[in-house]
Amino acid sequence: QSPIFGPQDVSSIEGNSVSITCYYPDTSVNRHTRKYWCRQGANGYCATLISSNGYLSKEYSGRASLINFPENSTFVINIAHLTQEDTGSYKCGLGTTNRGLFFDVSLEVSQVPEFPNDTHVYTKDIGRTVTIECRFKEGNAHSKKSLCKKRGEACEVVIDSTEYVDPSYKDRAILFMKGTSRDIFYVNISHLIPSDAGLYVCQAGEGPSADKNNADLQVLEPEPELLYKDLRSSVTFECDLGREVANDAKYLCRKNKETCDVIINTLGKRDPAFEGRILLTPRDDNGRFSVLITGLRKEDAGHYQCGAHSSGLPQEGWPVQAWQLFVNEESTIPNSRSVVKGVTGGSVAIVCPYNPKESSSLKYWCHWEADENGRCPVLVGTQALVQEGYEGRLALFDQPGSGAYTVILNQLTTQDSGFYWCLTDGDSRWRTTIELQVAEATKKPDLEVTPQNATAVIGETFTISCHYPCKFYSQEKYWCKWSNDGCHILPSHDEGARQSSVSCDQSSQIVSMTLNPVKKEDEGWYWCGVKEGQVYGETTAIYVAVEERTRGSPHINPTDANARAKDAPEEEAMESSVREDENKANLDPRLFADEREIQNAGDQAQENRASGNAGSAGGQSGSSK
């Protein structure tokens, strides 16, 4: 007996699709070996139609897929647009040849069933409305009209022209005639449910002279659309329920035994398990809407249904659309932190992965808001201005080719706590959700800037210092000037290889920045930060105000400022001495290369006079040049 298991008999009708699930023993070899679906020929040979190696036969082109689910020890063969030619004997199996482990499957595709000539077939989806047409001769124009449903030999009246309505059709069935028509009446049955399916007879008149019509009503359960998504990726359920429910509340629910638990609806209900990672977006006025779920988890797999009803809850007899979501644990999306913690006044650096094949895509960072259907307004992007309220404290650093970009948010407050999304205009699967938790600070921040009230005077030299603890000793220190399109790292001179230090004096660790001479355009936010390669760490921000020299204020010449810098604790000198010819070069603000490259490339004019002094405790006194 074969250890592979599946359905022995599969039957369907022309035009439909089937999903055949084959189960295999849970072993490492089985999980990774080739899976196949082949058709058994009369000669005993089994011709491969599709395999997990990527093979797809001509007759299955565009209508079949084979997907392996190693975590469930199953693989699924989906075949659409069935024809009677697909009827036959097949094998689903494992192994490098089609003679390995397999299971025999018989597929039978029938024609759409035919009924007697006088039977009209009506095929409708659950929740929809059917209009049954009943013709009669003029002699029965004034006779009683009725519609009954066949139950065995009996035919039970559903509705008639004397205003009788069967209780199970109450408020759902109406009998009417259109305009001046004298030979036809109609019966509408709305909010169709599965038990409405069956054979109906409509009748005008009584006895042998009565006119009768047969109607076969088929009420279709929604065929779930199969969605295969990777762990940590995102899924969008596109729901189009039709104009008749355009004004009703919409919902997405997840089937759980016989109930369907609402995940989100347009009345403000939302399942806490999806907090921070779900959005419901109306698409148009015809009732179309979509639900996006990011950060997919293993437990998100299951049967989903969207629908509409004034209550915002599932109701029998209302239109629905269905999906089966599979979550593949062998994901291409890297595992990143789902919770990032910060403290008030501090900063966070959030790494956002994106598809490395799409390094030129636009990157964004948005704040998920819980109100109503959930929304995610963009706070910053590679070509998006920083949102009001985030000036000077939010920047996006793209790292082309690394498959990630970094978002830094500083000057944190407890109001910054919440959910944020990383997204690009490229591969929509790569949307990640981060929960930011900001707690009250219990100690001084790691980076401190002095002076804290920074006011620079035009034409003079201005220096601000950033004190850092010994734990950042080996990391790269930088100053950058914040602008609406990022924080542009200021040029510096390479001080040469820094001496390694055995001891570290906590008080002497300083990186300073000097503006010489100060200009009006130097006003703005400056950040002091640490990083290791492309991994950004802590940052702190300071606003430098620039004012005109007031009459009588002493003029400090640059040498005095430098002398003062010499008296300061040992520093890593990052002094500006950019040559005049470098002023003409412009750096693309979207490039965040390391400081040496930026210096070589030249810099934006207003940043050329700014420099930072990075001090070392290794006995190398920093001095301005």
Partner: nanobody, 126 residues
Framework: QVQLVESGGGLVQPGGSLRLSCAAS????????MGWFRQAPGKEREFVTA??????????YYADSVKGRFTISRDNARNTVYLQMNSLKPEDTAVYYC?????????????????WGQGTLVTVSS
């Protein structure tokens, strides 16, 4: 809730036939799979057969021990599933249980079905 009621069990001679019925009531529109399991005295409950449906497609599953002898079928209008048992053997003697599952994607052989009937006894003996 879904209620399941089995019928059709009884005493039959080896080589004989029997037809079991399982009528479902309640929220039957949520059911996607119905199966038959059996439990012989002193043994664990085992999978016999199942039928799964989605739209107008159906999928029938059989245990190796009953393949070719037992047939499962479904009457959609009556919300009933039938088990036609031919060429019965003494080892088929057991209490036969009908079960219903709401998920299309769980392994039909597993006993983690959502609803179960009370069972009907089938005895194959001469």
């Amino acid at each position: 809730q879904v209620q399941l009621v089995e019928s059709g069990g009884g005493l039959v001679q080896p080589g004989g036939s029997l037809r079991l019925s399982c009528a479902a009531s309640g929220r039957t529109s949520s059911i996607s799979t119905m199966g038959w399991f059996r439990q012989a005295p002193g043994k664990e409950r085992e999978f016999v057969t199942a039928i799964r449906w989605s739209g107008s497609s159906s999928y029938k599953y059989y245990a190796d021990s009953v393949k070719g002898r037992f047939t499962i079928s479904r009457d959609n209008a009556r919300n009933t599933v039938y088990l036609q048992m031919n060429s019965l053997k003494p080892e088929d003697t057991a209490v036969y249980y009908c079960a219903a599952q709401m998920s299309l994607w769980r392994d039909p052989r597993e006993i983690d079905y959502d609803y179960w009937g009370q069972g009907t006894l089938v005895t194959v003996s001469s």
